[in-house]
């Protein structure tokens, strides 16, 4: 006869694992009792249990309630068990030694695997600037065994750098992705992703990249110059910029207060029907926590009247 | 052949402790199998408990959490520790040694020594 096992048995942590033993003899042959033993090197072998064909299973106190036999119906020629919860602690080399009659006594050894499935983690990096030069954006560090794998899933152009900490019976992995800040990648997923033999599918871990910034700013309402005569309504000057963490405006005039019955709406400037006051330079100020822009424009209000004689007096010259 | 000699039984009070030891001798194989067995008056004979040479054990659940067996492999020595014993662990108490045989396994059993549980 002969015994038909496994090389590696492999289980995830926590699952039971089945450590197969089966005795194909030839007819009329019986099996007397399985005896299985944990037989690492270096270490005498320490027995786990047996199963005796006459008064059943009997289990080592270092193992009990965590070996059993297979769920009915049992072939008596299968000395195979179940390692309830696997742990860690029970990664190794096992023997199982099959005790005949009439043959005599067969052994064989497989190695029992446990997969630590990773629990991923991921840490942002300092706060993103425009403007800095290559910086961390994130770290993503996953401990299992066998090691996993850690890569980066992005459509943001970047470096990463990865590096390995092993230890007794695990190894952590830390992949780190670095990039040079630009507003463009405000709102863009970094995405790490941990693969494992333990685990069904990748974990997925996402982090939100946000980069501050303040663009420049410019002022928009003055386009045409000759719309700012005396008695318009409803002229408005708007200051242009964007930026994060969303920017404050502030509005003041260069030479003086801000006239009276002009409002400050925001980003907005609003004038009352218009006055020759209403002349001067206004400053738009824009600002963030990470920094500030100034844009200045002149108003100049026409007086239709002062035009109109020029184009008189133009008329008459010629 | 095989020779199982027990001894430690005796009159003990409900709640108390007794101790239990067959020493073997003769012809012991290396996958021997040694335990104790019970036998109350009018009552089958029954399993208490065994244990493998590796250490390995198997109990009886009317035993578990109160009996622990054990054994000398060096002095081919078998030991039941009975404790919290009730009134109905009265019984006599027969070690078995179990040995290969043919095709099968083959029981050797002691004379037996009884034990008496008072309540």
């Known amino acids: 006869g002969e015994l038909e096992t496994s090389d590696v048995v492999t289980v995830v942590l926590g699952q039971d694992a089945k450590l197969p033993c089966f005795y194909r003899g030839d007819s009329g042959e019986q099996v007397g009792q399985v005896a299985w033993a944990r037989v690492d090197a270096g270490e005498g072998a320490q027995e786990l249990a047996l199963l005796h064909s006459k008064y059943g299973l009997h289990v080592s106190p270092a193992y009990e309630g965590r070996v059993e036999q297979p769920p009915p119906p049992r072939n008596p020629l299968d000395g195979s068990v179940l390692l309830r919860n696997a742990v860690q602690a029970d990664e190794g080399e096992y023997e199982c030694r099959v005790s005949t009659f009439p043959a005599g006594s067969f052994q064989a050894r497989l190695r029992l695997r446990v997969l630590v499935p990773p629990l991923p983690s991921l840490n942002p990096g300092p706060a993103l600037e425009e403007g800095q030069g290559l910086t961390l954006a994130a770290s993503c560090t996953a401990e299992g065994s066998p090691a996993p794998s850690v890569t980066w899933d992005t459509e943001v152009k970047g470096t990463t750098s990865s590096r390995s900490f092993k230890h007794s019976r695990s190894a952590a992995v830390t992949s780190e992705f670095h990039l040079v800040p630009s507003r463009s990648m405000n709102g863009q997923p970094l995405t790490c992703v941990v693969s494992h033999p333990g685990l069904l599918q990748d974990q997925r871990i996402t982090h939100i990249l946000h980069v501050s910034f303040l663009a420049e700013a410019s002022v928009r309402g003055l386009e045409d110059q000759n719309l700012w005569h005396i008695g318009r309504e409803g002229a408005m000057l708007k200051c242009l910029s964007e930026g994060q963490p969303p920017p404050s405006y502030n509005w003041t005039r260069l030479d003086g207060p801000l006239p009276s019955g002009v409002r400050v709406d925001g980003d907005t400037l609003g004038f009352p029907p218009l006055t020759t006051e209403h002349s001067g330079i206004y400053v738009c100020h824009v600002s963030n926590e990470f920094s500030s822009r100034d844009s200045q424009v002149t108003v100049d209000v026409l007086d239709p009247q002062e035009d109109s004689g020029k184009q008189v007096d133009l008329v008459s010259a010629s | 052949e095989v020779q199982l000699v027990e001894s430690g039984g005796g009159l003990v009070q409900a709640g108390g402790s007794l101790r239990l030891s067959c020493a073997a001798s003769g012809s012991i194989s290396s996958i021997n199998l040694m335990g104790w067995h019970r036998q109350a008056p009018g009552k089958q004979r029954e399993l208490v408990a065994t244990?493998?040479?590796?250490?390995?054990?198997n109990y009886a659940d009317s035993v578990k959490g109160r009996f622990t067996i054990s054994r000398d492999n060096g002095k081919n020595t078998v030991y039941l520790q009975m404790n919290s014993l009730k009134p109905e662990d009265t019984a006599a108490y027969y070690c078995v040694d179990v040995e290969p045989s043919g095709m099968g396994w083959r029981d050797y059993w002691g004379q037996g020594t009884q034990v008496t549980v008072s309540s």
């Open positions: 244990i493998t040479r590796g250490g390995s054990t």
